[in-house]
């Protein structure tokens, strides 16, 4: 039975040209995390494999940095980066857990940030 829950940064906003950390945390399970995939719609942004480390998809290599931890840092943000992001936790023996984050990239000089996991 899948007992785990994913806590995410939820709905967040950031300034155009800036950077933001996407962060998820899996809790309430003893399942082993084998891999975490970061996705945007049908695009795979990055994979963090427990044994092999990070793979950043070539489409995003210039603007995506691994970490901190299992999180992902998006850099040089544009308005087109606005949208849903998903962290997919592949675990054994539970299976797959999915977390959702909504990012809004703002043109204005002042962007409201969510309370957790954000770059100050």
């Amino acid at each position: 039975m899948m007992t785990g829950t994913i806590e995410t940064t939820g709905n967040i906003s950031a300034e155009k040209g800036g950077s933001i950390i996407l962060q998820c945390h899996l809790s309430s399970t003893t399942a082993q995390v084998t891999q975490v995939n970061w996705e945007q719609q049908d695009q795979l942004l990055a994979i963090c494999n427990a044994d092999l480390g990070w793979h950043i998809s070539p489409s995003f290599k210039d603007r995506v940095a691994p970490g901190p931890g299992l999180g992902l840092t998006l850099q040089s943000l544009t308005v087109n980066d606005t949208g849903e992001y998903f962290c997919i936790y592949h675990t054994y023996p539970d299976g797959t857990y999915t977390g959702r984050i909504f990012l809004e990239v703002l043109e204005s000089s002042v962007a409201e940030h969510g309370a957790r996991f954000q770059i100050p």
């Epitope: 995939n37 996705e39 695009q43 795979l44 489409s59």
Partner: antibody, heavy 120, light 107 residues
Framework: EVQLQESGPGLVKPSETLSLTCAVS????????WNWIRQPPGKKLEYIGY???????YYNPSLKSRVTISRDTSKNQFSLKLSSVTAADTAVYYC??????????????WGQGTTVTVSS | DIVMTQTPLSLSVTPGQPASISCKAS??????VAWYLQKPGQSPQLMIY???YRYTGVPDRFSGSGSGTDFTLKISRVEAEDVGVYYC?????????FGGGTKVEIK
């Protein structure tokens, strides 16, 4: 250039253990991921498992109870052991390198393959 | 496990003509797909990774496309050296799995 060379017996009796070794030249096995893949006659390529740069292993769940992948860093080689073999384990066995950081799970260097037949 | 299904099983192409191979995944694998060519008597060689990126040294007549569950490998103008069996592979999640292969021959 990275070169991989499989070696081991071409004939194994049913219920015995298949043992293969892959000698690697031109690259250290303490970097990247080192893999075994097989292809039974007329069937799909099947991923067996890997040993990572740090020595961690992953085995395909369909073979997990019978597979051991190990390495000898002093000889720059890694090995496959598959126990309790049957005729279904008859295949061409490939050792291969995977550069996860750059190519994800895409295998960029392959050995030439060695044919193993399981028969009494 | 994710099942990768390739079509057609075989393809006979006139030199200079285009060729197209399809690969369907049993579930969404985003863009975590690679393509290989296994020439007669040789090991597989990597052609495409991340669905659409050519590996080092692969001629630009080869192109990959797709995301989600449907992927395509195209050869814009087939040459004699392109014969062999083409395989797709997903690496979205372990165990990484391969398609059954498409054999490309020259007419």
């Amino acid at each position: 250039e990275v070169q991989l060379q499989e070696s081991g017996p071409g004939l194994v009796k049913p219920s015995e253990t298949l043992s293969l070794t892959c000698a690697v030249s031109g690259y250290s096995i303490t970097s990247d991921s080192w893999n075994w893949i097989r292809q039974p006659p007329g069937k799909k390529l099947e991923y067996i498992g890997y040993i990572s740069y740090s020595g961690n292993t992953y085995y395909n769940p369909s073979l997990k109870s019978r597979v051991t992948i190990s390495r000898d860093t002093s000889k720059n080689q890694f090995s496959l052991k598959l126990s309790s073999v049957t005729a279904a384990d008859t295949a061409v066995y490939y050792c291969a390198r995977l550069d996860f950081s750059n190519y994800g799970g895409a295998v960029d260097y392959w050995g030439q393959g060695t044919t193993v037949t399981v028969s009494s | 496990d994710i099942v990768m299904t390739q079509t057609p099983l075989s393809l006979s192409v006139t030199p200079g003509q285009p060729a197209s191979i399809s690969c369907k995944a049993s579930q969404n694998v985003r863009t975590a797909v690679a393509w290989y060519l296994q020439k007669p008597g040789q090991s597989p060689q990597l052609m495409i990774y991340s669905a659409s990126y050519r590996y080092t040294g692969v001629p630009d007549r080869f192109s990959g496309s797709g995301s989600g569950t449907d992927f395509t490998l195209k050869i814009s103008r087939v040459e004699a050296e392109d014969v062999g069996v083409y395989y797709c592979q997903q690496y979205y999640t372990t165990p990484w799995t391969f398609g059954g292969g498409t054999k490309v021959e020259i007419k």
